[in-house]
């Protein structure tokens, strides 16, 4: 049951959340499957259903606790099974033993507002959801604008190498819409990878004064 | 049933080596998992080092350098060798194996490692 083909994917949100994503070629498309989680030095043990997300790919959510509460820390392993139904029984179709802040995945950057707008400049600060303190300063961002005819994809991205929640967007054209997004990522993790970006922020630079270059 | 049967575990100098074997009843290529285990007095459980069916190894990292899982599918037998050992690894050692099934959990006796001068 438990083979190559089988791929189980998942990540720490840095509290109390677990997301997995498993995906099997030919798997049962009506079988009800679960993620179980047994961790190594605590008391709980966690289980979500696997929904499908496509046709041959289903994802669920370990919700180990209240969103804010520290659920696991850096010594922890978590047994992960994926465990799908045959009759009365549930079979083990794939297992990992995972390390949760070697497997880090934020959730997105809320709050997004703009503190104060011109002609060419906007700036916008943001706020970190549900993050660790355990990561104290070690995180950084990535941040992309998306300006008129372009696409999100076309957005050059702009680093921030440090915990910066504000920037400052410079060389903008006045009067003109544009739309912001951030992300974060902790410095800390192996396998680690970058939050989901934010939802967009839409802001407008002011029009340039009659006459004037601001 | 499988049943789990550890053995090497002792006495031994800090910086010592030792090698814990884990010898199973049935076949452990049936088996999802194998892993080691221990708890000190006083202290949580804790997972040591483990071997899914498809060879993914992982170790806690306060032994990764130091300690080697291995496994023998012929002798249905699964290894720990243990080197650098420090007096914090002082700990019963218990052998765990997951089944093909949810409901199949199986743990030996355990075996004493103390690691004292």
């Known amino acids: 049951a438990v083979n190559g083909t089988s791929q189980f994917t998942c990540f720490y949100n840095s509290r109390a959340n677990i997301s997995c994503v498993w995906s099997q070629d030919g798997a049962l498309q009506d079988t009800s499957c679960q993620v179980h989680a047994w961790p190594d030095r605590r008391r709980w043990n966690q289980t979500c259903e696997l929904l499908p997300v496509s046709q041959a790919s289903w994802a669920c959510n370990l919700i180990l606790g209240a969103p804010d509460s520290q659920k696991l820390t850096t010594v922890d392993i978590v047994t992960l099974r994926v465990l799908c139904r045959e009759g009365v029984r549930w079979r083990v179709m794939a297992i990992q033993d995972f390390k949760p802040f070697e497997n880090l995945r934020l959730m997105a950057p809320i709050s997004l507002q703009v503190v104060h707008v011109e002609t060419h400049r906007c700036n916008i600060s943001w706020e970190i959801s549900q993050a660790s303190h355990y990561f104290e300063r070690h995180l950084e961002f990535e941040a992309r604008t998306l300006s008129p005819g372009h696409t999100w994809e076309e957005a050059p991205l702009l680093t921030l190498k440090q915990k910066q929640e504000w920037i400052c967007l410079e060389t903008l054209t006045p009067d003109t819409q544009y739309e912001f997004q951030v992300r974060v990522k902790p410095l800390q993790g192996e396998f680690t990878t970058w939050s989901p970006w934010s939802q967009p922020l839409a802001f407008r630079t002011k029009p340039a004064a009659l006459g004037k270059d601001t | 049933q499988v049943q789990l049967a550890e053995s090497g575990g002792g006495l031994v100098q800090p910086g010592g080596s030792l090698t814990l074997s884990c010898v199973a009843s049935?076949?452990?290529?049936?088996?999802?998992?194998m892993a080691w285990y221990r708890q000190a007095p006083g202290k949580m459980r804790e997972l040591v080092a483990s071997i899914t069916s498809i060879g993914s190894i992982v170790y806690a990292d306060s032994v990764k350098g130091r300690f080697t899982l291995s496994r023998d599918n012929t002798k249905n037998t699964v290894y720990l060798q243990m080197n650098s050992l420090k007096p914090e690894d002082t700990a019963v050692y218990r052998c765990n194996a997951l089944g093909t099934w949810s409901d199949e959990t199986y743990w030996g006796q355990g075996t004493q490692v103390t690691v004292s001068s």
């Open positions: 049935g076949s452990i290529l049936e088996m999802s998992r």
